[in-house]
């Protein structure tokens, strides 16, 4: 075998809704023939599977061989190095991979304007991964909340921020005009998954959005 | 929303050492990581490093690899830059940016909530 391969120093999964992305980062001085290794585990099933003999790139999307991770205890994943015959020792994900540590996003955030109010429609990730009855609203079927962060351009950064349990909220301007500016984060209120914030969204309020009423 | 904040640039002789910043302002930071992007004129942005948030771990561009270390101390919500052995291909515009998906961490479209930049020069 020669001298011994070093091992990737670090390996994790990153992950939102079906996009399961497994990182480690690069050994030390590594030659332009280094390749990496990766290999599978599935909880309830104790063997290794070969998921990539030679990936060239520092990450490898698992989205396709992990779809039914919202229905399983979970998955490690194992990564070494590979230089022609010579191999490093395995670096295992060194936490379970399971729905815990997906982190939550927003498809997007739709606003409009009536009669004074910006009313908001979060639409949900609807990846194209995902089989067709694994909906993000089957699979976090309850508890779902938002945390609407509203930021008034120009402004000084200052923010009101509002925590809502449906996927349409309204916010009310107090009589103000300008471009407001929405940020969405999602939680499951009975899970521990972190949250994302969306990215954010502007819609301009003029006087002519308000009716006069007597 | 989330603001990103780079200082510590300025004007430096080649094989002289700079150290930069990047604070995160606005709320606690919680993306996955922060990576530094650096822009020479006429040039297109590219990936000058970056780092994971939780498990520290690092990334180079093979130009910077063995000369610069990127760092992060999560309680101040900051990323540092060290640069040393500076060359005059070092000189750019140095742009801070979070990770906000799961994708590379060598991919532009992994990041977002961009930074103002800060100069970097450094003259032979």
């Known amino acids: 075998h020669g001298t011994e391969l070093p091992s990737p120093p670090s390996v994790w999964f990153e992950a939102e809704f079906f996009h399961h992305i497994l990182h480690w980062t690069p050994i030390p001085n590594q030659s332009e023939s280094t390749c990496y290794e990766v290999a599978l585990l599935r909880y309830g099933i104790e063997s290794w599977n070969s998921i990539s003999n030679c990936s060239q790139t520092l990450s490898y999307d698992l989205t396709a061989v992990t779809l039914d991770l919202y229905h399983s205890n979970g998955y490690r994943a194992r990564v070494r190095a590979v230089d022609g015959s010579r191999h490093s020792n395995w670096t295992v994900t060194n936490t379970r991979f399971s729905v815990d540590e997906v982190t939550l996003t927003v498809g997007s955030v739709n606003l409009e304007i009536h009669n004074g109010f910006i009313l908001g429609k979060i639409q949900l990730p609807r990846p194209k991964m995902a089989p067709a009855n694994d909906t993000y609203e089957s699979i976090f079927s309850h508890f779902r909340e938002y945390e609407i962060a509203i930021r008034k351009v120009p402004g000084n950064f200052t923010f009101t921020h509002k925590k809502v349990k449906h996927e349409n909220f309204s916010l009310l301007t107090s009589g103000e005009v300008g471009e407001f500016c929405v940020q969405v984060k999602p939680s499951v209120a009975s899970r521990s998954n972190k949250g994302m914030w969306s990215k954010e969204e502007c819609i301009s309020l003029t006087r002519q959005y308000f009716t006069v009423t007597n | 929303q989330l603001q990103l904040v780079e200082s510590g640039g300025g004007l430096v002789q080649a094989g002289g050492s700079l150290k930069l910043s990047c604070t995160a302002s606005g709320r606690t930071f919680d993306g996955y990581g922060m990576g530094w992007f650096r822009q020479a004129p006429g040039k297109e942005r590219e990936f000058v490093s970056a780092?994971?948030?939780?498990?520290?771990?690092?990334y180079y561009a093979d130009s910077v690899k063995g000369r610069f270390a990127v760092s992060r101390d999560k309680a101040k919500g900051t990323m540092y830059l060290q640069m040393n052995s500076l060359k005059p291909e070092d000189t750019a515009v140095y742009y801070c940016?979070?990770?906000?998906?799961?994708?590379?961490?060598?991919?532009?479209?992994?990041?977002?909530?961009w930074g103002q930049g800060t100069q970097v020069t450094v003259s032979s």
């Open positions: 780092i994971n948030w939780i498990y520290g771990a690092t």
């Open positions: 940016a979070a990770k906000i998906n799961a994708g590379s961490y060598f991919n532009i479209g992994s990041f977002g909530s």
